[in-house]
Each structure stands twice: as structure tokens, then as C-alpha cells.
């Protein structure tokens, strides 16, 4: 279809870099949640850190293009990276509008399809763009 | 600032491909940006043709998708526009174009392509 | 696509006079209730320049006597007060679908 995709705009404060350019913000006539309108793709992604006792939001927005998973209804999160000991970056790519707001489900820490607790390390910052 | 300039041959022969190309200073085109093709016929009507984004994706307008090819050439900063099968309806004056956004702020000066034998 | 309909195609003004330019659209170049509708001046021999993006934002550097306005459909153009650099042809553009499209132009000549 021709229509642009829109999606939910946030960027955790703290975050490095930003994929704001990536598209246009809209106005929504409320603060939160912002609205982003895709430039080059037509599919959100939304990225959230899961620790022990809850997952955080870090960024939502769109992608700079088209990939595997944008074909996805609905955002299921997949383990990406650890930014620190305990805690897991989780990632999803869906290609409806807004389909970035939420998780469908997320695993638990240390299930089975995380990464095992030696994975790799990463500063904050590069951990968000290594999950991108 | 963005500055961008068009350059190619001002007269092609009908079957045979158009080719031009973009040099944009002032601005990486790896930084941001979508980088246009615009033309406007001789009855001054515009048409969008595509794009090439900074991280080299593409889209193109469906009108011409079967004859259109935007690439970049990152070491010299120039994004060029191939249109084969030319015939005298590609007549046009060619812009190429830079957007942040979907409308067009940045503009080459354009150059006249005529399609003749 | 969609399709843009300018109105007048030309016409004949004095300086200081209000001039306005419509802009039809085929369907709403709306998103969630933003308008993606812009308006470019383009002068002989000179490429388009950028007036208003978003249906009513002015462009840096434009003079304040352009303004726009609209929604959905329907999309206008003014110039409060007609100066000789004025004097040129005006068009829309629409980027809320693929392929972005332009309106035909409205040719602003003295009267």
C-alpha cells in the first residue's frame, strides 16, 4: 500500500544517537505518546531492557528500511544483548501502525532463547545501536 | 550549506538511456537526507521519480519503476539517475533534490535533457 | 495516485492586492490529523522554492505575507499583500502517499 507507516516515537533519556531523522513527528494533540511517520520504511521496531523485576522501554521509532520481521502484525520481542549483567535488550521489527507500543509477551530473564548470562557485554549506548 | 548540481548530456537519442548525475556539497549524502530526482516537463507540469536515501535504500515512482535506477557514488558525494528506454514524453528539464523531510528544501539549478534523434 | 487540482490556473493581480490559490486533493493527504501538504513558488529559468511545508508552516526566510491553511482535502494559499517579487507561478505538492504528486500550478501574472 502506498501509506506511510506511523509508529510510536520515544528515546529513553541517556540513549546515544537517535533515528529521529528516520522519519517525521507528528502532532497527536497529547505530549505522550509521540507519533512518528516513517520516511524509508514502513516498519517500527521497538527496543526494551528486561531485568529482574521489569522491562523498560529504551526506544521506539522506525526503521531506516525494510528488513526481515517487518512483515510481523505485532511486536515479538527477541533477546539482542546485555547491556550489563541481569538485564537483556529485547528488539522487535512489525510493520502495522503504532505495532511498536507494546511487547506481545516477553520471556522471562534466563529462559530458554536468551542469551546465556556470558554473552556479550556492551556500554549502554552501544548496546541499544548492537540491538538495532 | 546544501548545494546540489546537476551535470550530463543535454540531448539523448530516443531507445537509448538518459544519465545524470548530482554532486551535492556542503552535505554528506551519507548523513541524512533523501536524495530526489524531480523533472518538470515542457508544459511545466513536476514529477517526483525517486529517491536514494542515506543508507542507500531506494524508492521510485511506480510510473517508472521499470526504467528507473537511482545509485550512489559516496567517495565523491554524487547520487546519479538512469532512465532507459528514453523516448520524446522524457523531454524534461531534470532536478535533483535534497528533503530531510517528504517535501523538497534543497534544490539543484536542473538541466534540460532533450530526447531527440 | 493522488491527484491535485490547482485553481485559477492563472491569474491577474495588482500589487498590494490578497491573492488566493486553492489546492484540491483526490483524497485526504492527512495522517492522524497532520497535513502533508506543502506550497513552492518557482520563478523562469529557477528551480521551485519552498514556501509552506505542512499546509500552514513557513518556511525560514519566506516574508510572513505567505500563509497557508486547510485539511483533508481542501488546501489554500495566500498572499496578504501582492509585492513584484511575487509574480511568479505557485504549486502544491502532497507527501502523505506514494508517489508524492504535484498540483498543475497556478501562474500569479500583473494585472
Known amino acids: 500500500p502506498p501509506n506511510r507507516r506511523t509508529c510510536v516515537f520515544f528515546e529513553a533519556p541517556g540513549v546515544r544517537g537517535s533515528t529521529k531523522t528516520l522519519g517525521e513527528l507528528l502532532d497527536t494533540g497529547t505530549e505522550l505518546p509521540r507519533a512518528i511517520r516513517c520516511l524509508y520504511s514502513r516498519c517500527c521496531f521497538g527496543i526494551w531492557n528486561l531485568t529482574q523485576d521489569r522491562a523498560q522501554v529504551e526506544m521506539q521509532g522506525c526503521r531506516d528500511s525494510d528488513e526481515p520481521g517487518c512483515e510481523s502484525l505485532h511486536c515479538d520481542p527477541s533477546p539482542r544483548a546485555h547491556p550489563s549483567p541481569g538485564s537483556t535488550l529485547f528488539t522487535c521489527s512489525c510493520g502495522t501502525d503504532f505495532c511498536n507500543a507494546n511487547y506481545s509477551h516477553l520471556p522471562p530473564p534466563g529462559s530458554p532463547g536468551t542469551p546465556g548470562s556470558q554473552g556479550p557485554q556492551a556500554a549502554p549506548g552501544e548496546s541499544i545501536w548492537m540491538a538495532l | 550549506q546544501v548545494q546540489l548540481q546537476e551535470s550530463g548530456p543535454g540531448l539523448v537519442k530516443p531507445s537509448e538511456t538518459l544519465s545524470l548525475t548530482c554532486t551535492v556539497s556542503g552535505y554528506s549524502i551519507t548523513s541524512d537526507f533523501a536524495w530526489n530526482w524531480i523533472r518538470q516537463f515542457p508544459g511545466k507540469g513536476l514529477e517526483w521519480m525517486g529517491y536514494i536515501s542515506f543508507s542507500g535504500s531506494t524508492s521510485y515512482n511506480p510510473s517508472l519503476k521499470s526504467r528507473i535506477t537511482i545509485s550512489r557514488d559516496t567517495s565523491k558525494n554524487q547520487f546519479s539517475l538512469k532512465l532507459s528506454s528514453v523516448t520524446a514524453a522524457d523531454t524534461a528539464v531534470y532536478y535533483c533534490?535534497?528533503?530531510?523531510?517528504?517535501?523538497?528544501?534543497?534544490w539543484g539549478q536542473g538541466t534540460l535533457v532533450t530526447v531527440s534523434s | 495516485d493522488i491527484q491535485l487540482t490547482q485553481s485559477p490556473s492563472s491569474l491577474s493581480a495588482s500589487v498590494g492586492d490578497r491573492v488566493t490559490i486553492t489546492c484540491r486533493a483526490s483524497e485526504s493527504v492527512d495522517t492522524y490529523g497532520n497535513s502533508f501538504m506543502h506550497w513552492y513558488q518557482q520563478k523562469p529559468g529557477k528551480p521551485p522554492k519552498l514556501l509552506i511545508y505542512?499546509?500552514?508552516n513557513l518556511e525560514s526566510g519566506i516574508p510572513s505575507r505567505f500563509s497557508g491553511s486547510g485539511s483533508g482535502t481542501d488546501f489554500t494559499l495566500t498572499i496578504s499583500s501582492l509585492q513584484p517579487e511575487d509574480f511568479a507561478t505557485y504549486y502544491c505538492q502532497q507527501s502523505n502517499e506514494d508517489p508524492y504528486t504535484f498540483g498543475g500550478g497556478t501562474k500569479v501574472e500583473i494585472k
Open positions: 533534490a535534497g528533503s530531510r523531510y517528504s517535501w523538497f528544501a534543497y
Open positions: 505542512r499546509a500552514s
